[in-house]
């Protein structure tokens, strides 16, 4: 089973130091600051799910050196930054979207020995995520226009 | 296979510094998500875990003890050290260490998988 | 600090006998709970973690279970080679604890 913890409370300060190893954040409705990071030294599990976030701001990650799991399922994701695709040893957990294939194809050029990225569809169902880019997503359209939500399943 | 072994000075009297090393095989310490913690357990009780050194060299102590805590490592040595100043006779345990590391398929979980056999410490004038 | 309370302290079972070992946390811990075995003289090996998952090799009569702040470890039908102490963990906060153990006997 995947390791859980608890919702935090709604009201985040995002000037405040979080200690624990994993925090919960689903389903609160959150806007994430562009110019803060957070601050959760020990974190290895983040969940962002559930939160209607539209992208992911690198900034916020920046200071997350021992994350290991990100979980943004049920979001509409319209881009994924490269520089957090490019941590090869972060876990992502998202919605199958057209809007991952940036993340595909940085892992794929700059991440090796890496097992296949999965995505999730709306009956939480697992799909390698070549496979869904793939089927789903013709070619060169999320990366031409920017987005590739077209795709998005709610 | 993933070993560890702890070594340590077994006697030593009040006031003094103890060191103790973790020498290991199997893995590396440079591995992103791997780290070793040092966890002591007095003679009939429980476990108290005292510090975690982190594949990047960050750190994390015991509160209660981490005036007295250093934790450091050799990466190209395969070994961990920590030492504890001013012992008392509280500080009489054994000492372990244990390894932590990130698995894909435990990948956000944090256990102890493999533990050394410990050391015996005294501290005794 | 997370304080963790294993009960009981000492139960002796009968061989085939269904055991169950409490944990409880101070606080809200999720599933971030590890149970570890120790046989005399030696060190702990880890049986459960995640508050439910087997850990590699353990045999499949040890189950785990709870979430928050109540853990359960069961030994669906106790061997005589389960003689130990029997150590919960938390690792949701540093600094990480443990509970103060639960002696199984064996009649």
């Known amino acids: 089973l995947e390791p859980s913890c608890t919702v935090s409370s709604a009201d985040v300060d995002w000037n405040a130091e979080f200690s624990a190893t994993c925090l919960n954040f689903s389903g609160l409705s959150l806007s994430l600051p562009h110019n803060q990071s957070l601050r959760a030294s020990n974190v290895i599990l983040l969940d962002l799910s559930g939160n209607g976030l539209r992208e992911l701001p690198v900034t916020f990650f920046a200071h997350l050196q021992k994350l290991e799991v990100l979980n943004v399922l049920r979001n509409p994701l319209s881009r994924v930054d490269g520089a957090l695709a490019a941590r090869c040893d972060l876990d992502l957990q998202a919605d199958c979207n057209c809007a991952l294939e940036s993340w595909h194809d940085i892992r794929r050029d700059n991440c090796s020995g890496q097992k296949p990225l999965l995505c999730w569809d709306t009956t939480s169902s697992q799909h390698n995520l070549s496979a869904f880019l793939e089927v789903s997503c013709a070619p060169g359209l999320a990366s031409a226009t920017g987005s590739g939500h077209h795709h998005h399943h709610h | 296979q993933v070993t560890l072994k702890e070594s340590g000075p077994g006697i030593l009297q009040p006031s003094q510094t103890l060191s103790l090393t973790c020498s290991f095989s199997?893995?590396?310490?440079?591995?992103?998500?791997?780290?070793v913690s040092w966890i002591r357990q007095p003679s009939g009780k429980g476990l108290e875990w005292l510090a975690h050194?982190?594949?990047?060299?960050?750190?994390r102590y015991n509160p209660s003890l981490k005036s007295r805590l250093t934790i450091s490592k050799d990466t190209s040595s395969n070994q961990v050290f920590l030492k504890i100043t001013s012992v008392d006779t509280a500080d009489t345990a054994t000492y372990y260490c244990?390894?932590?590391?990130?698995?894909?398929?435990?990948?956000?979980?944090?256990?102890?998988?493999?533990w050394g056999a410990g050391t015996t410490v005294t501290v005794s004038s | 600090d997370v304080v963790m309370t294993q009960t009981p302290k000492s139960m002796s079972m009968s061989v085939g006998e269904r055991v169950t070992l409490s944990c409880k946390a101070s606080?809200?811990?999720?599933?971030?709970v590890s149970w570890y075995q120790q046989k005399p003289e030696q060190s702990p090996k880890l049986l459960i973690y995640?508050?439910?998952n087997r850990y590699t090799g353990v045999p499949d009569r040890f189950t785990g279970s709870g979430s928050a702040t109540d853990f359960t470890l069961t030994i669906s039908s106790v061997q005589a080679e389960d003689l130990a102490d029997y150590h919960c963990?938390?690792?949701?906060?540093?600094?990480?604890?443990f509970g103060g153990g639960t002696k199984l006997e064996i009649k």
């Open positions: 995640g508050a439910s």
């Open positions: 199997g893995f590396s310490l440079s591995t992103s998500g791997m780290g």
């Open positions: 050194i982190y594949w990047d060299d960050d750190k």
């Open positions: 244990a390894r932590r590391h990130r698995d894909y398929d435990s990948r956000g979980h944090w256990y102890f998988g493999v």
């Open positions: 963990g938390q690792s949701y906060n540093y600094p990480f604890t």
């Open positions: 606080e809200n811990v999720g599933t971030y």
